[in-house]
């Protein structure tokens, strides 16, 4: 499995998970692939406490999270239920805005500079956060 007993170097432990904060930028799909190659996934935000932790470590930067509606409904990359889970959208979001002129709407979610979420064009290059579970049982 992908669970670990301690976090890898340069990863930050919080509440049973390990987090890695990028310093470069990538489109959502490339960020998602990067996390998978690290046996992790784009961060799944499940609580206000986790949201606050992430904000403290990210700084005020647009940062991809593991939430997308590229397949229709909004879904977290690890299968966590979107409908019943924590949500922290900016007011008026998500809006699937077409006005950017790049074709299509907006299908990937990111932290904005104030930490609340926005949907944006998935191919925009933003920072990202990877997350993997920490196995405390071993």
């Amino acid at each position: 499995g992908s669970e670990r007993t301690c976090c890898p170097i340069n990863w930050v432990e919080y509440e049973g998970s390990c987090y890695w904060f990028s310093s470069s930028v990538r489109p959502w799909t490339e960020a998602d692939k990067y996390c998978q190659l690290e046996n992790a996934h784009l961060v799944v935000v499940t609580s206000r406490d986790e949201q606050n932790f992430l904000q403290r470590h990210m700084g005020p930067l647009n940062t991809w999270i593991g939430l997308t509606d590229q397949n229709g409904p909004w879904k977290w990359v690890d299968g966590t239920d979107y409908e019943t889970g924590f949500q922290n959208w900016r007011p008026e979001q998500p809006d699937n805005w077409y006005g950017h002129g790049l074709g299509g709407g907006e299908d990937c979610a990111h932290f904005t500079t104030d930490g609340r979420w926005n949907d944006d064009v998935c191919r925009r290059p933003y920072r990202w956060v990877c997350e993997t579970k920490l196995d405390k049982a071993n």
Epitope: G72, W89, D95, W97, G105
Partner: antibody, heavy 117, light 107 residues
Amino acid sequence: EVQLVESGGGLVKPGGSLRLSCAASGFTFSSYSMNWVRQAPGKGLEWVSSISGSSSYIYYADSVKGRFTISRDNAKNSLYLQMNSLRAEDTAVYFCARGGSRGFDPWGQGTLVTVSS
Amino acid sequence: DIQMTQSPSSLSASVGDRVTITCRASQSITSYLNWYQQKPGKAPKLLIYTASSLQSGVPSRFSGSGSGTDFTLTISSLQPEDFATYYCQQSHSFPFTFGPGTKVDIK
């Protein structure tokens, strides 16, 4: 289960008005763009209007612009289409559907609007 | 506005046949092309989104391809329940537009 149910269709005279409703259930309604699509008897599909999750962005087909108004009430999980100055060519089955750039899914069962004197 | 055309407008086929329907956009829509199936008296059903992604629950005999202006829907082995009308739709930009449809009936 994700479900959309339209209502409000019926027979109306030319120049009259009608308000269609679409009741949504089984998903976080405010997170999704919603749409109206119509189909005249024996004809193909025609996109009518779209509205973003928070009503920030609204779009209309030229054929209905200035006559139809799309709106939503996220507290009631409902989508509406106010149709004014109706014409014979507006006769169609009207469908509501969820979604945007990744296609419309699901669709409601449709409600028939007949404009005739 | 982006115009969508489909060919053929109708076709007759037998169970087991391989069926191909084409859709053309009047300008590039990159991959923002969706395919729907509609049976008489029913609402349309999403089959393929963004040109080639199979909608959840749709049989794998349906596939889509193409990008830019030219797109194809293929049914690898036609089944009795596949006799219906098929529509393409662009979701690249507003106003969204549908193709005129292709009716697939029994030979």
